[in-house]
């Protein structure tokens, strides 16, 4: 009696159980009563990652440098290429199909948390007593210079974008 179901790593065709092709190989011809399933390895730029009966291998993913992508792991006949973002960029989606540059914090803002491969820079306004005069993805707000510790006085007040300017103390004439 012809089978109605087949074992694992087999498939049913023409009332017969044929072996599936192993990962990295595609189907050329189904088995017959007298011959085993015929499979062929995928070419260098292709892959199949499961036991299968596919007649075509899948093309490896292309990591497009125009989208900020680079190869993280080269594909094999059994695995797809894995792309990742270039340094200074992060993924725009879960599947990481494109990348965007890490945000820079503008003058008056400092970096609260640097970016990761999946999340952007977090910026914060510089509070009173701190400043940032650069646009940066790494720089935190810096404290104003303490003129007193240098035996100087504040000549120009600091802002969130500029440091204080220190100057010599006016010496009173006798």
């Amino acid at each position: 009696e012809p089978p109605t179901a087949c074992r694992e790593k087999q498939y049913l065709i023409n009332s017969q159980c044929c072996s599936l092709c192993q990962p990295g190989q595609k189907l050329v011809s189904d088995c017959t009563e007298f011959t085993e399933t015929e499979c062929l390895p995928c070419s260098e730029s292709e892959f199949l990652d499961t036991w299968n009966r596919e007649t075509r291998c899948h093309q490896h993913k292309y990591c497009d440098p125009n989208l900020g992508l680079q190869v993280q792991q080269k594909g094999t006949s059994e695995t797809d290429t894995i792309c990742t973002c270039e340094e200074g960029l992060h993924c725009t989606s879960e599947s990481c199909e494109s990348c965007v540059p890490h945000r820079s914090c503008l003058p008056g803002f400092g970096v609260k948390q640097i970016a990761t491969g999946v999340s952007d820079t977090i910026c914060e306004p510089c509070p009173v007593g701190f400043f940032s005069n650069v646009s940066s993805a790494f720089e935190k707000c810096r404290p104003w210079t303490s003129c007193e510790t240098k035996d100087l006085v504040v000549q120009q007040a600091g802002t969130n974008k500029t440091d204080v300017v220190c100057g010599p103390q006016d010496r009173q004439r006798a």
Epitope: T84, V118, S119, I122, E124
Partner: antibody, heavy 115, light 107 residues
């Protein structure tokens, strides 16, 4: 001081639902992406879900996709995790954590799924 | 998914010892790696981020190094309060993943 406090854990039967909350204080909640991480008894850490600072992007671990929903209310400084179709393997302490580099963390809330 | 393999999984050491924990990633993750310390019944605490940057308030005896696929956490001189479990975590791609943990116990 900077603080995250989870609540809403408890004992629930398989197939039922539960909603966890995470109340933030001492920092600007609305600029941070927020995460849920869980830890089964005696086991390691497992990342569960993330939501972007404005709620526009959400990603989930495969083990909870389609069952759990992460959300936030920036006006209330609160993060949520709606857990549906709960399974025994969801039993864990659930932590919320803030920011790109998971700092700070809450103290955790225990969810036990058992019949 | 990116797998993180921590070694050793268990470590017995004495106060004052230099301790090194390794974390290997199954794919390159640049420097997007964090280290956490967890004590029993407590939440994890961030020690190191971006592979080598010490989190504010963390003692300087903790240091991190590495990039790509191989990373290390070093405690230069183990203190009584350092006996805990340590986890690495990659933040390069979703889903974010943690290593299996390294338990540091008193010899």
């Amino acid at each position: 001081q900077v603080q995250l406090v989870e609540s809403g854990g408890g004992v629930v039967q398989p197939g039922r639902s539960l909603r966890l909350s995470c109340a933030a204080s001492g920092f600007t909640f609305s600029i941070y992406g927020m995460h849920w991480v869980r830890q089964a008894p005696g086991k390691g850490l497992e990342w569960v879900a993330v939501i972007s600072y404005d709620g526009s992007n959400k990603y989930y671990a495969d083990s909870v996709k389609g069952r759990f929903t992460i959300s936030r209310d920036n006006s209330k400084n609160t993060l949520y995790l709606q857990m549906n179709s709960l399974r025994a393997e969801d039993t864990a302490v659930y932590y919320c954590a803030a920011g790109n580099w998971f700092d700070p963390w809450g103290q955790g809330t225990l969810v036990t799924v058992s019949s | 998914d990116i797998q993180l393999t921590q070694s050793p999984s268990f470590l017995s050491a004495s106060v004052g010892d230099r301790v090194t924990i390794t974390c290997r990633a199954s794919q390159g993750i640049s420097s997007y790696l964090a280290w956490y310390q967890q004590k029993p019944g407590k939440a994890p605490k961030l020690l190191i981020y971006a592979a080598s940057t010490l989190q504010s308030g963390v003692p300087s005896r903790f240091s991190g190094s590495g990039s790509g696929t191989e990373f290390t956490l070093t405690i230069s001189s183990l203190q009584p309060e350092d006996f805990a479990t340590y986890y690495c975590q990659q933040l390069n791609r979703y889903p974010l993943t943690f290593g299996g943990g390294t338990k540091v116990e008193i010899k």
